[in-house]
């Protein structure tokens, strides 16, 4: 990761774009910081890897969270 | 539809400072990384600075570095770019643009959106 | 300071013909970090390909990217009129951010 970026937040940009929770490879929450006052979501998706940084304020991410929270609920004995 | 406008060009003495503005339109602005690019006269792109969405990360070039300030104004949906100290290889047009929706320090989605630019003249 | 550099300078095709432009970095690039545009005279430059084979949004599949490590190619399947102008590769990575190659102009034969 170039470090020059790796200083501060995560997230340059943040999308509102509805994830499929079956296109995700991973789905990781930060929480804020010393480094970064935001919470940041990022998406990596099944396809190429691509990492994505989601808004936690839109309804659809919130959703998505719900979604694979209950997912994971149900895996977990 | 999507646009950004730049203003705020024109024609300055080496030393002196300018401001540019970019005003954006079409999409919510508070959501996306900015950068300011430059072109030399007959030359090439030359990237210059970035903000990240909620203006905390902040980064430019080297050749810049200690003489320009970027920054933006959320609930105005502008960007801009102090100026300082200005020399003759400043002298360029100045783009806009916007760093594609998603973007992070592991996956870089691209300038998507760009200005037509603004010229910046620095000359005695 | 990771270089890159774009060849030919220049290229010299005719409208139906495949276009093929390199573009070289002096140390490895992730291809998560590179990405295409296309600029004509008097115009703003325009994203065509991010992530190294990712098209963006609108844009033909005559044009296609690929590559990894040091080497990255932007491919022009048949070039259309409107394909006629400069392109230049980027990389985002550290110190400087980012970097654009020098370009290759594609013009008419």
């Known amino acids: 990761v170039p470090l020059s970026r790796t200083v501060r937040c995560t997230c340059i940009s943040i999308s509102n774009q509805p994830v499929n929770p079956r296109s995700l490879e991973k789905l990781e929450i930060i929480p804020a910081s010393q480094f970064c006052p935001r919470v940041e979501i990022i998406a990596t998706m099944k396809k190429k890897g691509e990492k994505r940084c989601l808004n936690p304020e839109s309804k659809a991410i919130k959703n998505l969270l719900k979604a694979v929270s209950k997912e994971r609920s149900k895996r977990s004995p | 539809q999507v646009q950004l406008v730049e203003s705020g060009g024109g024609v300055v003495q080496p030393g002196r400072s300018l401001r540019l503005s970019c005003a954006a339109s079409g999409f919510t602005f508070s959501r996306f990384g900015m950068h300011w690019v430059r072109q030399a006269p007959g030359k090439g792109l030359e990237w210059v600075a970035v903000?990240?969405?909620?203006?905390?990360?902040?980064y430019y070039a080297d050749s810049v570095k200690g003489r320009f300030t970027i920054s933006r104004d959320n609930s105005k949906n502008t960007l801009y770019l102090q100026m300082n100290s200005l020399r003759a290889e400043d002298t360029a047009v100045y783009y806009c643009?916007?760093?594609?929706?998603?973007?992070?320090?592991?996956?870089?989605?691209?300038?998507?959106?760009w200005g037509q630019g603004t010229t910046v003249t620095v000359s005695s | 300071e990771i270089v890159l550099t774009q060849s030919p300078g220049t290229l010299s095709l005719s409208p139906g013909e495949r276009a093929t432009l390199s573009c070289r970095a002096s140390q490895s690039v992730s291809s998560s970090y590179l990405a295409w545009y296309q600029q004509k005279p008097g115009q703003a430059p325009r994203l065509l390909i991010y992530?190294?084979?990712s098209r963006a949004t609108g844009i033909p599949d005559r044009f296609s990217g690929s590559g990894s490590g040091t080497d990255f190619t932007l491919t022009i399947s048949r070039l259309e009129p409107e394909d006629f102008a400069v392109y230049y590769c980027q990389q985002y990575g550290s110190s400087p951010i980012f970097t654009f190659g020098p370009g290759t102009k594609v013009d008419i034969k």
């Open positions: 992530g190294a084979s």
């Open positions: 643009a916007r760093e594609g929706a998603g973007s992070n320090i592991y996956y870089y989605y691209g300038m998507d959106v």
């Open positions: 903000i990240g969405y909620a203006g905390d990360n902040k």
